[in-house]
């Protein structure tokens, strides 16, 4: 019988060892009161797989699209 | 029936160890990634460990990294977590879930099979 949670965070772990390369596309997710959830579809197996937002071209990516979204 | 039972909590002192199993009965674990989740009062349900299901990679948070470890033995159903080192900040109720996709970094994971979770206790 499955306990219900008192909320619902899409991504509970979480891909460290994920190559740029190997992504599709990434959604960004702003979920209350859930970490950053970052999905990736991966071309190897078209999963969707929940990345670490610690990857360093994570961090690259999010501050390029950050500084892309305020820029005047 | 279909559940998942939890099993080998406790109270232990700080410093100890324990040894959680989570048995499938009903259905076989081979197919399913399973995570180990805790929860303490007053606090979120957080993720604290997960093992896939094909390739046997594991995940862990940061904070039972390097003192908990997660194994599976499939021809028993049962999913183990051991955890050493412990701490009483690791006080919570520990579940255990399945999830059908396999793996554990799965978009939307864990919305199926939850037991019913056991209580640890880590106290002087």
């Known amino acids: 019988k499955p306990v219900s949670l008192s909320y619902r965070c899409p991504c509970r772990f979480f891909e460290s060892h994920v190559a740029r390369a190997n992504v599709k596309h990434l959604k960004i997710l702003n979920t209350p009161n859930c970490a950053l959830q970052i999905v990736a579809r991966l071309k190897n197996n078209n999963r969707q797989v929940c990345i670490d937002p610690k990857l360093k071209w994570i961090q690259e990516y999010l501050e390029k699209a950050l500084n892309k979204r305020f820029k005047m | 029936e279909v559940q998942l039972v939890e099993s080998g909590g406790g109270l232990v002192q700080p410093g100890g160890s324990l040894r959680l199993s989570c048995a499938a009965s009903?259905?076989?674990?081979?197919?399913?990634?399973i995570g180990w989740f805790r929860q303490a009062p007053g606090k979120e349900r957080e993720g604290v460990s997960c093992?896939?299901?094909?390739?046997?990679?594991?995940y862990y948070a940061d904070s039972v990294k390097g003192r908990f470890t997660i194994s599976r033995d499939n021809a028993k159903s049962t999913v183990y977590l051991q955890m050493n080192s412990l701490k009483p900040d690791d006080t919570a109720v520990y579940y255990c879930a399945a999830e059908a996709m396999g793996y554990c970094s799965a978009y939307g994971s864990f919305e199926g099979y939850w037991g019913q979770g056991t209580q640890v206790t880590v106290s002087s």
């Open positions: 009903g259905f076989t674990l081979d197919d399913y990634a």
């Open positions: 093992i896939n299901s094909n390739d046997g990679n594991t």
